[in-house]
């Protein structure tokens, strides 16, 4: 398991002893008395696995330490960075003849990743490593590690991998970190073209020609090319690309559209602000996402505002006539910002004992003019069962309702068929007319057929022709209709409701508001 350590972008690490959790487990020869794996603490008090040897007493030391197999990942030249601490022989009295202050670095190429033994003859020497700064007293105690860092390179390599080896010849040394890496020209973007990670060439003077590909949402103008140098730097850019959808050119780059902006097509245009009720959630949007509760229909253009389903229809009125029901309603207060509003009728048949247990009415029920896609605000439902509870739902729908169906878009009424509703009211009177109000009074129906629970007054401006009406309900046989417009003709209908349902509306009473209050007695006919 390795932890992440940050290195320059143009270096790819093949081995990092500091990133290994637990023992390194490299092979030492001899197995005992030579290199030894020891855990020390770094400046942050975290353990570091090191290899140490300090056989300074005897001459002719030949202690070898070999790494595990290191894959070369296609690299032809690799670099070895060694961080080590070397103890000054002067700090070890009486060992001047046998103590050394250098060690040797070797490598061996191999396709075999499981070689168990060190065969010294197979290894080629890279270099003798000496300390730039050896020391007499140790600096680990105050948590400041004074380390020597030496970097060597080797190549060209051709086999799948290689082993490194360290030969101690009698030094007092600790290998604190061994890192093996190769150099690459890192993925980069120049002139709107992206150039991939490219491993450097085999020798220190080679240039590798690389063809670039246009950045996302851009297209070629001239073929983009660059050269990867041996030090991992890109050289001599040629060619370029043009910005595409979701991006605009800024400072010579294709920059993603900012949040709240989008660009739908490949053009030279800048990014545009998202249409109403939409937003972009990330940079580089080619379209904008609708706000919560807002949607686009399939055939809506990306530049169109997002819309939402309509609110519920208003003022649902039912009229039961034996096994038929007439329903009327008003348009929703909110159409969701769309013109394509229509209505669907849902019929449910409910049990008398438990009204909550309802099921669909089935195909035997008929609707005039139709059940779904109604453009008018009324429907007649026939062929219902007698003595049965029905719940009718009127759903307002538009082009985006399917994306968010909700009970908030419907209004319902429950009726019982084949029960006697009250008869219609024969006489409605306007008791007082002012500029802004009309006081109405009426008589109880000739046939109440039960206890009258309430009266319902429907009224509308005469020239609206019942397209937009209002409803007032009252338990009394009179009411004041307020908030009217002066010098305007209104039509009033009244009906009674019992437990059996609503009766028919009365004949219309037409009243014109005026400028001077006067008492007018209506007889059910037109009054002015």
């Amino acid at each position: 398991v390795t932890g992440s350590r940050v290195y320059p972008a143009n270096e790819v690490t093949l081995l990092d002893s500091r990133s290994v959790q637990g023992e390194l487990g490299w092979i030492a020869s001899p197995l005992e008395g030579g290199w030894e794996e020891v855990s020390i603490m770094d400046e942050k008090n975290t353990p570091i696995r090191t290899y140490q040897v300090c056989n300074v007493m005897e001459a002719s030391q030949n202690n070898w330490l070999r790494t595990d197999w290191i894959t070369r990942e296609g690299a032809q030249r690799v670099y070895i960075e060694i961080k080590f601490t070397l103890r000054d022989c002067n700090s070890l009295p009486g060992v001047m003849g046998t103590c050394k202050e250098t060690f040797n670095l070797y490598y061996y190429e191999s396709d075999n990743d499981k070689e168990r033994f060190i065969r010294e003859s197979q290894f080629g020497k890279i270099d003798t490593i000496a300390a730039d700064e050896s020391f007499t007293q140790v600096d680990i105690g105050d948590r400041i590690m004074k380390l020597n860092t030496e970097i060597r390179d080797v190549g060209p390599l051709s086999k799948k991998g290689f082993y490194l080896a360290f030969q101690d010849v009698g030094a007092c040394i600790a290998l604190v970190s061994v890192r093996v890496f190769y150099k690459k020209c890192p993925l980069t973007v120049r002139n709107l073209a992206q150039f991939p990670d490219t491993i450097t060439g085999a020798d220190t003077s080679s240039l590798v020609e690389v063809r670039g590909s246009c950045v996302n949402n851009s297209e070629e103008k001239d073929v983009p090319k660059m050269y990867c140098g041996a030090d991992g730097e890109w050289l001599v850019p040629i060619g370029n690309c043009l910005c595409n959808a979701g991006h605009e050119e800024q400072n010579g780059e294709c920059q993603a559209c900012k949040i709240g902006y989008y660009k739908a097509l490949s053009t030279d245009a800048s990014c545009a602000k998202c249409p109403p009720h939409s937003y972009s959630v990330w940079e580089g949007a080619t379209s904008c996402t609708c706000d919560r509760g807002f949607f686009r229909a399939d055939n809506d253009a990306a530049s169109m505002p997002c819309t939402r389903p309509p609110s519920a229809p208003l003022n649902l009125i039912s009229n039961v006539n034996e096994t038929s029901v007439n329903l009327e309603w008003s348009s929703p207060q909110n159409t969701g910002g769309r013109q394509d509003i229509s209505y669907n009728v849902v019929c449910k048949k409910c049990g008398a004992g438990d009204p909550s247990k309802c099921r669909p009415c089935g195909s035997g029920v008929h609707y005039t003019p139709q059940q779904n896609g109604l453009k008018t605000t009324r429907v007649s439902i026939t062929d219902l069962l007698a003595h049965t509870n029905y719940t009718f739902e009127i759903w307002a729908v538009n082009g985006v309702s399917k994306y968010n169906p909700s009970p908030d878009q419907s209004v319902s009424v429950t009726v019982t068929t084949n029960q006697a509703a009250p008869s219609s009211i024969a006489l409605v009177q306007a008791k007082e007319v002012t500029r802004y109000s009309v006081a109405l009074a009426w008589l109880e129906p000739d046939r109440p057929n039960g206890v009258i629970l309430e009266y319902e007054v429907k009224y509308y401006e005469k020239d609206q022709n019942e397209r937009s009406y209002r409803i007032v309900r009252t338990a009394a046989r009179n009411t004041d209709i307020k908030g009217l417009n002066p010098l305007t003709s209104y039509v009033f209908h009244v009906r009674a409701r019992t437990a059996a349902g609503y009766g028919d509306f009365s004949e219309p009473l037409e009243v014109t508001t005026n400028t001077v209050p006067s008492r007018i007695i209506g007889d059910g006919a037109n009054s002015t």
Epitope: N55, M57, Q137, V138, I140, G141, A174
Partner: antibody, heavy 121, light 106 residues
Framework: QVQLLQSGAEVKKPGASVKVPCKAS????????MSWVRQAPGQGLEWMGW????????TYAQGSTGRFVFSLDTSVSTAYLQISSLKAEDTAVYYC??????????????WGQGTLVTVSS | EIVLTQSPATLSVSPGERATLSCRAS??????PAWYQQKPGQAPRLLIY???TRATGIPDRFSASGSGTDFTLTISRVEPEDFAVYYC????????FGQGTKVEIK
């Protein structure tokens, strides 16, 4: 396994000499230095010095008198501590201990069981 | 010559408690001391040496830290077998021991 074997207790008269052997086994004798430490009764540890077992070169503690001599017989993997002109204050347990050199500092990682030298008239 | 002073002379702790032993050098040193444990009638045993490295077989409840002149040996949870005398030892051209700290049962 690695061990250091010391001789049994010695009782000496003042002015006499004593030679304390320390026989090593389980490792290459000449690869590690040997240190000598003494501990007077009820007292702490006192480092006396060490000897390079490869070259025979000794290093004595500061202030050490010439009465202490470290020597070797590598053919039998044995280090010796010789004390001459013994005094009553030389009464102590004498330990040999193998030295562990490392780049980050030194320690004595294997100890003999100690030899009690008693100087009494 | 560097003089090492250990404190306290005696430390009374109960098993399971944390024990902190101090070792102060008479002048600043750039290397951590070695630490030894000695039980009555036995030879000392190396606990910790260069760069706070535990010797072979020493449990990880023993740890050492410090810099300059002040160094510490910590026993995170004292076990019954840890009651003993502990010595710090400075290495260099001449080696010296501290006078020892006795860790006893409270």
């Amino acid at each position: 396994q690695v061990q250091l074997l010391q001789s049994g207790a010695e009782v000496k008269k003042p002015g006499a000499s004593v030679k304390v052997p320390c026989k090593a086994s389980g490792y290459t004798f000449t690869s590690r230095a040997m240190s000598w430490v003494r501990q007077a009764p009820g007292q702490g540890l006192e480092w006396m010095g060490w000897i390079n077992t490869n070259t025979g070169n000794p290093t004595y503690a500061q202030g050490s008198t010439g009465r202490f001599v470290f020597s070797l017989d590598t053919s039998v993997s044995t280090a010796y501590l010789q004390i001459s002109s013994l005094k009553a204050e030389d009464t102590a347990v004498y330990y040999c201990a193998r030295v562990r050199f490392t780049v980050y500092g030194d320690g004595m990682d294997v100890w003999g069981q100690g030899t009690l030298v008693t100087v009494s008239s | 010559e560097i003089v090492l002073t250990q404190s306290p002379a005696t430390l009374s702790v109960s098993p399971g408690e944390r024990a902190t032993l101090s070792c102060r050098a008479s002048q600043s040193v750039s290397s951590n001391p070695a630490w030894y444990q000695q039980k009555p009638g036995q030879a000392p045993r190396l606990l910790i040496y260069g760069a706070s490295t535990r010797a072979t077989g020493i449990p990880d409840r023993f740890s050492a830290s410090g810099s300059g002149t002040d160094f510490t040996l910590t026993i995170s949870r004292v076990e019954p077998e840890d009651f003993a005398v502990y010595y710090c030892q400075q290495y260099g051209p001449s080696w010296t021991f501290g006078q020892g700290t006795k860790v006893e049962i409270k």
